[in-house]
Amino acid sequence: APVLPGEDSKDVAAPHSQPLTSSERIDKHIRYILDGISALRKETCNRSNMCESSKEALAENNLNLPKMAEKDGCFQSGFNEDTCLVKIITGLLEFEVYLEYLQNRFESSEEQARAVQMSTKVLIQFLQKKAKNLDAITTPEPTTNASLLTKLQAQNQWLQDMTTHLILRSFKEFLQSSLRALRQM
């Protein structure tokens, strides 16, 4: 099974090396998840032509995937550490239902999909420790998530393929924006 950063022998600090700081651990963790997304995207792109599809904007309108915007304070312009950290955690919590949807969408990369989901949960915990302003973080309602999951799973095959592609692309983009922002903190 895929290992999380810190479980791999390569990540264990050598006798004379410095242990990872909290920021370095988070950085490494996000990069680990991004590598997992890359593997999942590879399988998705190989089995369908969704990655080159021009119809994705149509499908995207029906998905409410978390997205970074300038007001979130994570971009270089208008950067705000507290606002941004809240946005990252809130966004990751919102992505959880979509990551759950991905669990039965892969054949050869089933373990990878599970690893992405589990390490995202761990990442949220890391970031919650880092956040001072926890009051501003809203957790999605379990009932809302359950009905969204049912709705997504009831789509036809083409829409399910498109949804998978869009979730992976959006999650990758969200994590990359998060990574860039966290490196400024």
């Epitope: 950085d27 991004l34 312009s77 983009e173 990359q176 990574l179």
Partner: antibody, heavy 123, light 107 residues
Framework: QVQLVESGGGLVQPGGSLRLSCAAS????????MTWVRQAPGKGLEWVSS????????AYADSVKGRFTISRDNAKNTLYLQMNSLKSEDTAVYYC????????????????WGQGTQVTVSS | DVVMTQSPSSLPTSLGDSVTITCQAS??????LSWYQQKPGQTPKLLIY???KLQTGVPSRFSGSGSGTSFTLTISGLEAEDLATYYC?????????FGQGTKVELK
């Protein structure tokens, strides 16, 4: 094959404006980060600005912040650099570059470069 | 801002020599460092990304190492076509920054 072709350079007076364009072909433009890098005569390389694929996230060097604006038109496969309030120190060859793609998801590295367009700011 | 200090600025050498160029970051940049080669009148070319990963098509005599704040580009057995200026680039945090460059030339 991948091609990046810059245009829009030229001679402009201090305080003037120019808009550089970079026409991309041979790859799915919308999937890649794009960056402008410049090189003043006889000097080293200077990172100017980057724009990310779908987020609209942009970043600028301190030397151009507030004067330059990077943008992209994914439908036209074109990258732009709007340069306002130009100064003599902006004189350089401006290169359009593509960030590494594929499995490489975080590492910044510019794998394709255009031939560059000359910008000269002089009175 | 992360400041990159590249050394030496000039490196007189002989063909066949092993050449080492270093880049020092003012703070940790993980492995977000790339190396470029630029010959006179030509556009820069990516050699190494992720501190140590060799870009496709680049000869294996080029290698990169380092992590955190200290990075090295090594050319094992310099060839005539390697005479050029070399730059490092930190891609860890804004604003990204190139090193000042190292000109590799014959003694």
């Amino acid at each position: 094959q991948v091609q990046l072709v810059e245009s829009g350079g030229g001679l402009v007076q201090p305080g003037g404006s120019l808009r550089l364009s970079c026409a991309a072909s041979g790859f799915t433009f919308s999937n890649y980060y794009m960056t402008w890098v410049r090189q003043a005569p006889g000097k080293g390389l200077e990172w100017v600005s980057s724009i990310y694929s779908f987020s609209g996230d942009t970043a600028y060097a301190d030397s151009v912040k507030g004067r330059f604006t990077i943008s992209r038109d994914n439908a036209k496969n074109t990258l732009y650099l709007q340069m306002n309030s130009l100064k003599s120190e902006d004189t350089a060859v401006y290169y359009c570059t593509r960030n590494l793609g594929g499995v490489v998801v975080t590492t910044n590295g510019y794998d394709y470069w255009g031939q560059g367009t000359q910008v000269t700011v002089s009175s | 801002d992360v400041v990159m200090t590249q050394s030496p600025s000039s490196l007189p050498t002989s063909l066949g020599d092993s050449v080492t160029i270093t880049c020092q970051a003012s703070q940790s940049i993980s492995d977000e460092l790339s190396w470029y080669q630029q010959k006179p009148g030509q556009t820069p070319k990516l050699l190494i990304y992720g501190a140590s990963k060799l870009q496709t098509g680049v000869p294996s005599r080029f290698s990169g190492s380092g992590s955190g704040t200290s990075f090295t580009l090594t050319i094992s057995g310099l060839e005539a076509e390697d005479l050029a200026t070399y730059y490092c680039l930190q891609g860890y945090s804004w604003p990204f920054m190139f090193g000042q460059g190292t000109k590799v030339e014959l003694k």
